[in-house]
């Protein structure tokens, strides 16, 4: 079952997700999606990074931590009840079936 995180309407929500880069700046692609992680990638992507930078994001979703050090925790700004649900953080470590995936449940009160 998913780990549960809580936030209040109008506040920012924080969904933690971390990995350890093989070397400083040696980043791997990460995607965040609304909904549980599918077989590959993310569904309904809200933010993604590549080997260098955040290269896709939608409004209200951002990375507040130092993603270059592997902190890819998601911040959702000014949440509403509609933001409740499961979120997928997928860390796409290169190789054969090496992905790490995390389903996180956000509860808005």
């Amino acid at each position: 079952s998913e780990v549960e995180y809580r936030a209040e309407v109008g506040q920012n929500a924080y969904l933690p997700c971390f990995y350890t880069p093989a070397a400083p700046g040696n980043l791997v692609p990460v995607c965040w999606g609304k909904g549980a992680c599918p077989v590959f990638e993310c569904g309904n992507v809200v933010l993604r990074t590549d080997e260098r930078d955040v290269n896709y994001w939608t409004s209200r979703y951002w990375l507040n931590g130092d993603f270059r050090k592997g902190d890819v925790s998601l911040t959702i700004e000014n949440v509403t009840l509609a933001d409740s649900g499961i979120y997928c953080c997928r860390i796409q470590i290169p190789g054969i079936m090496n992905d790490e995936k995390f389903n996180l449940k956000l509860v808005i009160k």
Partner: antibody, heavy 121, light 107 residues
Framework: EVQLVESGGGLVKPGGSLRLSCAAS????????MSWVRQTPEKRLEWVAT????????YYLDSVKDRFTISRDNAKNSLYLQMNSLRAEDTAVYYC??????????????WGQGTTVTVSS | DIVMTQTPSSLSASVGDRVTITCKAS??????VAWYQQKPGKAPKPLIY???TRHTGVPSRFSGSGSGTDFTLTISSLQPEDFATYFC?????????FGQGTKLELK
């Protein structure tokens, strides 16, 4: 117009090898995941392998993971499947397919016409 | 592996009929279900993804529904070109798996 054209199929003896190719056109190949799916003589569909847009992440069906290798050459708009140690149960029509992923992962939105692999002594 | 059980395996119907094909997943798959149509000698053609979203160009008579473990594909009014075999697939977890197919034939 999106086009995926497979080639390289044929008749091979058990234990033999084949290399399938898929030539892509009509879209930005390097912006899509790509997959191989096969259809058995009994018409069952079976996912075989998937490769990310950059080629960095690869996924296999358990029964082929030590025998098959999926790869791609984005400069040539081409997808490959190297098949070694072939078995009778690998006999199938092999399709390559495109997988959009950037804003929402969607499996196999375009398919090639298929290439037939027959493994028999 | 998640088993996708399609029913019926074959179905006879007439032009204009409303037809429903069902697919039951052996485990929870959220809405990560797709539907494909295949005609003899041709590659599968995508119809539906995310359980209910039609691919571009797919006629509105095709609709999908369901979540969790139970899914349906409905053709509201059969057209002559709809006689084909239909497959469901789940893409919730690895390996991606397909149903065994439903052959839709002219009555």
């Amino acid at each position: 117009e999106v086009q995926l054209v497979e080639s390289g199929g044929g008749l091979v003896k058990p234990g033999g090898s084949l290399r399938l190719s898929c030539a892509a056109s009509g879209f930005t190949f390097s912006s899509y995941y790509m997959s191989w799916v096969r259809q058995t003589p009994e018409k069952r569909l079976e996912w075989v392998a998937t490769i990310s847009n950059s080629g960095g992440s690869i996924y296999y069906l358990d029964s082929v993971k030590d025998r098959f290798t999926i790869s791609r050459d984005n400069a040539k708009n081409s997808l490959y499947l190297q098949m070694n140690s072939l078995r009778a149960e690998d006999t199938a029509v092999y399709y390559c397919a495109r997988d959009p992923y950037y804003s929402n992962y969607v499996p196999m939105d375009y398919w090639g016409q298929g290439t037939t692999v027959t493994v028999s002594s | 592996d998640i088993v996708m059980t399609q029913t019926p395996s074959s179905l006879s119907a007439s032009v204009g009929d409303r037809v429903t094909i069902t697919c039951k997943a052996s485990q929870y798959v959220d809405t990560y279900v797709a539907w494909y149509q295949q005609k003899p000698g041709k590659a599968p053609k995508p119809l539906i993804y995310s359980a209910s979203t039609r691919h571009t160009g797919v006629p509105s008579r095709f609709s999908g529904s369901g979540s969790g473990t139970d899914f349906t594909l409905t053709i509201s009014s059969l057209q002559p070109e709809d006689f084909a075999t239909y497959f469901c697939a789940q893409y919730s977890s690895s390996p991606l798996t397909f149903g065994q197919g439903t052959k839709l034939e002219l009555k």
